[in-house]
C-alpha cells in the first residue's frame, strides 16, 4: 500500500516518501525505492534556510550602498545576508530594502530613543521644567537652569523651547 503521508523532513512524490534536503542544500533528484534523495550544496552566493525540495537555491540579498545599505551579517549557505543602514540612516521596513535619514526632533521636543540602523528616532515633548531649542537627532530635553543654585532669580520664565533667564536679585534698601 503506497503511503499517503510522510514523516517529518520527508515529502511524498509519486507514492514514495523521500527525505527532504537539509538547509544549505538543493534537490537534484528525488529518491527511488533504491536510492536516497540527491541533494547538492548551494553555491557561495546562495542559500536555503529550511529542510526543502527546492531545485534552486535563493540568491543572497544584496545590500546596495546606493540605497544607503551595508552588510550587517554575511549570508551563509543556510542563512540570507542581513542588511542594515549606514550611519545616520535607518530601514524603511522590516526587510530593510532601503534607508532614509533619521528624523530630527524639533525645538520643544527631545530625543526619547536614539535611532538605530533599523529604527527611527523617537521624540517626546519636553515636559515642564525642560526645554530643547535645537533641531537634533540625538539631543534630549535639557532641564531649565536652576537660578537659585546660582544665587540668582528668574527674570524670564522658561518654555519647552527656551531656558529660563536668570538675573541678580533686587537688593532691598535699608
Amino acid at each position: 500500500e503506497p503511503p499517503t503521508a510522510c514523516r517529518e523532513k520527508q515529502y511524498l512524490i509519486n507514492s514514495q516518501c523521500c527525505s527532504l534536503c537539509q538547509p544549505g542544500q538543493k534537490l537534484v533528484s528525488d529518491c527511488t525505492e533504491f536510492t536516497e534523495t540527491e541533494c547538492l550544496p548551494c553555491s557561495e552566493s546562495e542559500f536555503l534556510d529550511t529542510w526543502n525540495r527546492e531545485t534552486r537555491c535563493h540568491q543572497h540579498k544584496y545590500c546596495d550602498p546606493n540605497l544607503g545599505l551595508q552588510v550587517q551579517q554575511k549570508g551563509t549557505s543556510e542563512t540570507d545576508t542581513i542588511c542594515t543602514c549606514e550611519e545616520g540612516l535607518h530601514c524603511t521596513s522590516e526587510s530593510c530594502e532601503s534607508c532614509v535619514p533619521h528624523r530630527s526632533c524639533l525645538p520643544g521636543f527631545g530625543v526619547k530613543q536614539i535611532a538605530t540602523g533599523v529604527s527611527d528616532t523617537i521624540c517626546e515633548p519636553c515636559p515642564v521644567g525642560f526645554f530643547s531649542n535645537v533641531s537634533s537627532a540625538f539631543e534630549k530635553c535639557r532641564p531649565w537652569t536652576s537660578c537659585e543654585t546660582k544665587d540668582l532669580v528668574v527674570q524670564q520664565a522658561g518654555t519647552n523651547k527656551t531656558d529660563v533667564v536668570c538675573g541678580p536679585q533686587d537688593r532691598q534698601r535699608a
Epitope: N14, S29, T32, F34, T35, E36, E38
Partner: antibody, heavy 117, light 109 residues
Amino acid sequence: QVQLVESGGGVVQPGRSLRLSCAASGFTFGSYGMHWVRQAPGKGLEWVAVISYEGVKKYYADSVKGRFTISRDNSKNTLYLQMNSLRAEDTAVYYCARDTSRGHDIWGQGTMVTVSS
Amino acid sequence: EIVLTQSPGTLSLSPGERATLSCRASQSVSYDYLAWYQQKPGQAPRLLIYGASARANGIPDRFSGSGSGTDFTLTISRLEPEDFAVYYCQQYADYPPFTFGGGTKVEIK
C-alpha cells in the same frame, strides 16, 4: 569525475561460476541503488538485478533468479554480481549502472562474459 | 510485466533529416517513468531523456521526448552524423523487471 568500471568477465564453462565487480568513483556510492544490465551479442538490453543503497532490497530478473546474487560493499565503493550455474544464454556484455529517479544515469563500459564448453 | 515495443526496428535517414522513434507500452507507465538511451557500437548506453520528456545533463536540444500513458516518442529534429546509433526506451515505474524496448537502429541512408 563520476565513473563506473566493471571487471571479472571472461570465458567460463557451463555450470561454473564467475563474480563480476563494479568499482565506483566520483560520487557518494553508498547513497545510490545500483543495477546490472546485460546485452547478448547483437541483441538488445536486458535488465538483470538491482540493489538498494544500503544493500537491503534486491530484485532479480526471472531469467537469473536463484542463480545470480547482487551485493555491494559500500566501504570499498564496489558492486558485485555473483553468477552461479552459468548457461550459454548468459553470454553477454554485463554493465553496471547507477539508479536515480531519472533512470540509469551513469553506466560502466561493460565486461564480457562468455559461457562456452 | 510491462512490455515495451519499439518501432520501426530500423530507420534509414540522411543527416539533417528528422527522426521519429516510437515506444509503445503494454500497459500505462505510471508517472511517465520512461527513459530513452542511445547506444553506439562498442559503447555503453547513454541516458538521453527521462520522465518521458526531460533532457538529461549535456544532451543537445535537438533531442526531445514526448508522450504519456502507453505511447511515447523520441524525436531528433535534425540528425547529426554522431546521432546514428541504436535507441532504447526503458520503463522504471513498474518492477521487477525494469524493462527495455527492443531498440530502434537509426542508420545512414
